[in-house]
Every structure is written in structure tokens, then in C-alpha cells.
């Protein structure tokens, strides 16, 4: 009886079990009662990767540079060409028929796995203690700056997108703040003293006065070491010194009382 099933690496045709062609060869003619299966090697640009009864070999895959592809492994008569993507690109699918640019990890995310020719960038959220403030296809999450190692203290906490801001410690801050405060206090004290002196010098409103001509009051008369005849610097509101013009005395006219 003719066979209904054949052994491995055989196929059934015309009630015959014929040998399949080995990888790298195509079928030219089926076996007969008197002949073997006839096979021929695939040509240079073709392949067959299995035991087969194909009458035509498959064309090697073309790695199209216009689609960002390049040859990773040249095909043989038994294997297909393997394409991969140019630098900065990865395959769109497993068959790698075209390429797309690698994805960048946004701020707050770092690169977990750098992209290859066949896989995209894998991003991960920056955990506590790490940050990323850039959009990048290469950079991992960076650890927050350690203020302690710099003998500084955290002035502003870090986030997944920003680093911590470090500042000087309390002792150092005191060395800066105390002199500033003392300076401010000294200026205030000076102003208070000037004000008190001015108030104390005012004439008594209750005493009768003869009618007087308008007279000039010299505020500097009472200041120790003042010379009313010498020109002095005046200061504008903006704290910039202004030189007194020559030939003018530093006196302020007081209006005659009504």
C-alpha cells in the first residue's frame, strides 16, 4: 500500500515519500519510484532556512538606508540578512522593516536602559533622592547634591526634577548676619540722636516773640567739629553723595512766622 505518512525530512507526493531539500537548496523535481528528489542550491541573493520542497528560494531582505536600516548580518543560502537601525534609531517592529528615533526621557525621568538598534529607550521615574532636569535619551536620574559633604545645609528641598539648594550653616550665617544687624542698629541710633537734638533745639512756642526777619538756621552748628563756612556733601534719597556747589553756603532758609 502507498504510504499515508512519511518520515521526518520527507514529504508525500504521488503516493511517494520524497526527501525534502536541505536548507540552502530549492526543489527542482520530486522523487519518483526510480529517482531521488532533485534539489539545487539557492543563488547568491537568495536563501531557504528549512528543509523544504520550495521551487523558489526567498530573496534576502534589503536593508534600506532610506528607512534608517543597515546590514547587521549578511545573509547566506541558509539564512536571511539581518537588518538593524542606524545610530540613534531603533526598529519599529520585530521584523525590523523600518526605524524610528529613540525616545527621550522627560525631566523627572531618567534612562533605565539605553536604546539599541532593536529596542527603544526605557525610562523610569526618578525615585526620592534623585532628579533629572533634562530631556535626554542617555542621562540617568542623578542623585541630589549632598549638602553635608560640603559643610552646607539644605536650604531648598530637591524634587524629581530639581536638585537640592544648599546654604551656609547657622554659625556661618551668624558671622554674616550679626555685623549687618549691628550696622543697621548703629545707623538707626545715629538717626534717633539727630532727631532728639533737633527737637531739643526748637524754641518754646509759649514765649512771646518780637517780629523777626526771616533767619537762617544752621543745623550743623551744634554738631561737634562742624565748620559752617565749609561746603559739605549732601545725600539724595538714593543714598548717592552729591558735592555742594562752590560759593553756596549749606544753609536752609526758614520762612518768617506769620
Amino acid at each position: 500500500e502507498p504510504p499515508t505518512a512519511c518520515r521526518e525530512k520527507q514529504y508525500l507526493i504521488n503516493s511517494q515519500c520524497c526527501s525534502l531539500c536541505q536548507p540552502g537548496q530549492k526543489l527542482v523535481s520530486d522523487c519518483t519510484e526510480f529517482t531521488e528528489t532533485e534539489c539545487l542550491p539557492c543563488s547568491e541573493s537568495e536563501f531557504l532556512d528549512t528543509w523544504n520542497r520550495e521551487t523558489r528560494c526567498h530573496q534576502h531582505k534589503y536593508c534600506d538606508p532610506n528607512l534608517g536600516l543597515r546590514v547587521q548580518q549578511k545573509g547566506t543560502s541558509e539564512t536571511d540578512t539581518i537588518c538593524t537601525c542606524e545610530e540613534g534609531l531603533h526598529c519599529m517592529s520585530e521584523s525590523c522593516e523600518s526605524c524610528v528615533p529613540h525616545r527621550s526621557c522627560l525631566p523627572g525621568f531618567g534612562v533605565k536602559q539605553i536604546a539599541t538598534g532593536v529596542s527603544d529607550t526605557i525610562c523610569e521615574p526618578c525615585p526620592v533622592g534623585f532628579f533629572s532636569n533634562v530631556s535626554s535619551a542617555f542621562e540617568k536620574c542623578r542623585p541630589w547634591t549632598s549638602c553635608e559633604t560640603k559643610d552646607l545645609v539644605v536650604q531648598q528641598a530637591g524634587t524629581n526634577k530639581t536638585d537640592v539648594v544648599c546654604g551656609p550653616q547657622d554659625r556661618q550665617r551668624a558671622l554674616v548676619v550679626i555685623p549687618i544687624c549691628l550696622g543697621i542698629l548703629f545707623v538707626i541710633l545715629l538717626l534717633v540722636l539727630v532727631f532728639i537734638k533737633k527737637v531739643a533745639k526748637k524754641p518754646n512756642d509759649k514765649a512771646p516773640h518780637p517780629k523777626q526777619e526771616p533767619q537762617e538756621i544752621n543745623f550743623l552748628d551744634d554738631l561737634p567739629g562742624s565748620n559752617p563756612a565749609a561746603p559739605v556733601q549732601e545725600t539724595l534719597h538714593g543714598c548717592q553723595p552729591v558735592t555742594q556747589e562752590d560759593g553756596k553756603e549749606s544753609r536752609i532758609s526758614v520762612q518768617e512766622r506769620q
Epitope: T32, E33, F34, T35
Partner: antibody, heavy 112, light 112 residues
């Protein structure tokens, strides 16, 4: 159904050429198989003479040296035997065969 | 060339008996793929040979299961389990593993 039908002269003079035709029906001779010529001498001894393959290639029995030629006409689905310089020793019944199917045989006598 | 030695030359049997014919080759008929192209033919009186068995043990279409083939390498046997009158004729073995193809000398099956 595959059928092989032979034709050709039954009498050939010594030193002349023997020519036989085999017409095939039911199967194309360009598809597969060896298309053989076999002869049977008086006393039943069988001798394989040669074949033309489906692809047109040939194989001959070295005992026939350079006297044999097997050709074909694919348009008519026929193949041919030509045996040159025949002698009385070539007197036999000639068969064309695919081996699973045989022609009816042609009895050829070489005689002057 | 490969010599095919067939025995016996003549085999007288009674109808219903089993008959066995032997064929030996001068070298192995197994090819590099492990296939052995050894065939058995029956030639009935006045007819062309007809294929019975191909590749040692495969019955050709339409051949009754009374006919079976066995063997490997260089030793082969054709067995007819229950001989009937229609089985009478000359049996030939033929190897087509190596060129030139060669036939056995034939075994004549006759009634006792």
C-alpha cells in the same frame, strides 16, 4: 492515464542507423522522470540503453559507446532513439519506458 | 557495471504455493540518502514488462498484496505468497541506483 506508443521500422540494414519514436500521452516529458530506451535480446536478456531526463539531459550505457543518441521534441511530447552503425547483434525488441509505464515494444531485425 | 545475479533461472511451483526469487548485486544498492532503488518486474508472455515493486518493498499501484519485496544492501527477495495462474511469466530485478542501470537475467515462474 500515462501511455507510451512506439513507432519505427522493424527492419534495418547493417551499418545503417536505427531510429525509433516514442509518443507520450497523459504526462508531459518535461515534468519529471527518466525517459528510457531498453532492449530485450532473444532469450529474454534485458539491456538498458540510456535515457533523456525531463530537463533534457542524457545518460547512456557505456557499452553502446558513441553509437547512441536520445533526443526529444517537447512540442509533440515525443522522444527518440537513434542507434548508428547497427549490426546483427542489435537485433532485439526495443522498448521505450518510464519504467512504471512501458511502450508496447518494437521488434527490430538487423539484416541485409 | 553492477552485475545483478538472479536465481533460480526457472521456478516450477504448484498453484497456491509460495514462491521466492532471489536477486544479488555485485555492490551495495543503497545510496548516500539511504534509498535503495531496486525494482521487480513481471513480463507475461507476449507483453511488455510491468512494474511490481519499487525501492525494494513498495508495491506499485494496482499490484496485489500477494507480492512483497524484502532485502537491503546487496541481497533482495521477491515473494509471491499464493501463486495463481496469472502470475506466470518471467520476473526481472532492475537496479537504478547506479548508471548504467542493470537487469537481472530473469526467473521463469512455471507450473509444476
Amino acid at each position: 492515464e500515462v501511455k507510451l506508443e512506439q513507432s519505427g521500422p522493424g527492419l534495418v540494414k547493417p551499418s545503417q542507423s536505427l531510429s525509433l519514436t516514442c509518443s507520450v500521452t497523459g504526462y508531459s516529458i518535461t515534468t519529471n522522470y527518466y525517459w528510457n530506451w531498453i532492449r530485450q535480446f532473444p532469450g529474454n536478456k534485458l539491456e538498458w540503453m540510456g535515457y533523456i531526463n525531463y530537463d533534457g539531459s542524457n545518460n547512456y550505457n557505456p557499452s553502446l559507446k558513441n553509437r547512441i543518441s536520445i533526443t526529444r521534441d517537447t512540442s509533440k511530447n515525443q522522444f527518440f532513439l537513434k542507434l548508428n552503425s547497427v549490426t546483427t547483434e542489435d537485433t532485439a525488441t526495443y522498448y521505450c519506458a518510464r519504467l512504471d509505464y512501458w511502450g508496447q515494444g518494437t521488434s527490430v531485425t538487423v539484416s541485409s | 557495471d553492477i552485475v545483478m545475479t538472479q536465481s533460480p533461472l526457472s521456478l516450477p511451483v504448484s498453484l497456491g504455493d509460495q514462491a521466492s526469487i532471489s536477486c544479488r548485486s555485485s555492490q551495495s544498492l543503497e545510496n548516500s540518502n539511504g534509498n535503495t532503488f531496486l525494482n521487480w518486474f513481471l513480463q507475461k508472455p507476449g507483453q511488455s514488462p510491468q512494474l511490481l515493486i519499487y525501492k525494494v518493498s513498495n508495491r506499485f499501484s494496482g499490484v496485489l498484496d500477494r507480492f512483497s519485496g524484502t532485502g537491503s544492501g546487496t541481497d533482495f527477495t521477491l515473494t509471491i505468497s499464493r501463486v495463481e495462474a496469472e502470475d506466470l511469466g518471467v520476473y526481472f530485478c532492475l537496479q537504478v541506483t547506479h548508471v548504467p542501470f542493470t537487469f537481472g537475467s530473469g526467473t521463469k515462474l512455471e507450473i509444476k
